[in-house]
């Protein structure tokens, strides 16, 4: 049994890091493998992650972490029984993938303005809370070409757009994702999408 693709990990910079790797053949990850991880810190304790299958030869493990900060560095040991298959390290702050925003809501009761709001996925005491920026994707269910991205570079998790920038009488969907420049993160996954019917009064033409 050998590792074909070494584990690569990403952290949500809060409580979970996800590591994925591939073996050289079909593997029952949960029964045959264990990923041991330990913070390189005084008094830290070793933890064991039981991987799940991710395709025939692929494995994925969700590492639980407390109080993640930029100085943290973890040792990783991948074991098959008594055999050490791979040894490495992982610094969560250098491989951050933020959590996806939640609770995306479209408020259509403001006259001729669409207000989209969502929730910041981090608590106020997490460093990323004040450092996320967002991308909002709006698209038409009827017209695949009617697809747009709005970059939200301010901290408030909301976006106002004129309803007239979208077609009237058509159903639209929106979703939002986040990233943080400070840790050069990747984009989060998209939030679940929300749907609304866009209707507004056309201005009376003279």
């Amino acid at each position: 049994m050998k590792v074909l693709q070494e584990p690569t990990c990403v952290s949500d910079y809060m409580s979970i890091s996800t590591c994925e790797w591939k073996m050289n053949g079909p593997t029952n990850c949960s029964t045959e493998l264990r990923l041991l991880y330990q913070l390189v810190f005084l008094l830290s304790e070793a933890h064991t992650c039981i991987p799940e299958n991710n395709g025939g030869a692929g494995c994925v493990c969700h590492l639980l972490m407390d109080d993640v900060v930029s100085a943290d560095n973890y040792t990783l040991d991948l074991w098959a029984g008594q055999q050490l298959l791979w040894k490495g390290s992982f610094k969560p702050s250098e491989h951050v993938k933020p959590r996806a925003p939640g609770n995306l809501t479209v408020h259509t009761n403001v006259s001729d303005t669409l207000l989209l709001t969502w929730s910041n996925p981090y608590p106020p005491d997490n460093y990323l809370y004040n450092h996320l920026t967002y991308a909002v994707n709006i698209w038409s269910e009827n017209d695949p070409a009617d697809f747009r991205i709005y970059n939200v570079t301010y901290l408030e998790p909301s976006l106002r757009i004129a309803a007239s920038t979208l077609k009237s009488g058509i159903s639209y969907r929106a979703r939002v994702r986040a990233w943080a420049q400070c840790y050069n993160t990747t984009w989060s996954e998209w939030s679940p999408s929300t749907k609304w019917h866009n209707s507004y009064r056309e201005p009376f033409e003279q």
């Epitope: 810190f41 005084l42 008094l43 830290s44 304790e45 407390d66 109080d67 900060v69 930029s70 100085a71 005491d125």
Partner: antibody
């Protein structure tokens, strides 16, 4: 919100021991390390040691080795710092502080006076 | 005695800028991150800066930190009378054993 509530002031005689408590609330107790530091009157801060509330393991500053004991009670989310063989130089305010590499939150401090 | 050295006192007028230095060595500041604590008279210390330059939520951006080599600096702009306090730098040292030294402390007086 995070709160670290420390026990009240103590007056001790030289040679005696003192046990200071620090009750934590507002966060997952076993997820954060706890430090102890002290400050003698008119002096700076001095680090004493650290405890991992999850397993109870400890590490102490060399200066206090053999005289200090840090423990925790997970059922009450409380950490304790006991200092023995007290001398007048141990007169200080003793602080618990939550954190790992740095101290996020501090208790208000417990004044310990050592006097004959 | 502390292995992190700070000036005993600094002073400046309201609205001015002041900097406080913290000098250490290769086994602590040179190899770790620096934090800064503010201690108002008669109160417990409060975290002001961590990770060399990050502010906890609620700390105004008048406070900033930086690190270069084996020394660090705390800068306070737009000084206010309420900033009058003792300031301590802190870090951790892993050699020969893990310890968390604090700086000697600096008394800031707002004139």
């Amino acid at each position: 919100q995070v709160q670290l509530v420390q026990s009240g002031a103590e007056v001790k005689k030289p040679g005696a021991s003192v046990k200071v408590s620090c009750k934590a609330s507002g966060y997952a107790f076993t997820s954060y390390y706890m430090h102890w530091a002290r400050q003698a009157p008119g002096q700076g801060l001095e680090w004493m040691g650290i405890i991992n509330p999850s397993g109870g393991s400890t590490s102490y500053a060399q200066k206090f080795q053999g005289r200090v004991t840090m423990t925790r009670d997970t059922s009450t989310s409380t950490v304790y710092m006991e200092l023995s063989s007290l001398r007048s130089e141990d007169t200080a305010v003793y602080y618990c502080a939550r954190g790992k590499y740095w101290m996020y939150d501090w208790g208000k401090g417990t004044r310990v006076t050592v006097s004959s | 005695q502390s292995v992190l050295t700070q000036p005993p006192s600094v002073s400046a007028a309201p609205g001015q800028k002041v900097t406080i230095s913290c000098s250490g060595g290769s086994s602590n500041i040179g190899n770790s991150y620096v934090s800064w604590y503010q201690q108002l008279p008669g109160t417990a210390p409060k975290l002001l800066i961590y990770d060399n330059n990050k502010r906890p939520s609620g700390i105004p951006d008048r406070f900033s930190g930086s690190k270069s080599g084996t020394s660090a600096t705390l800068a306070i702009t737009g000084l206010q009378t309420g900033d009058e306090a003792d300031y301590y730098c802190g870090t951790w040292d892993t050699s020969p054993v893990w310890e968390w030294p604090f700086g000697t402390g600096t008394k800031l007086t707002v004139l």
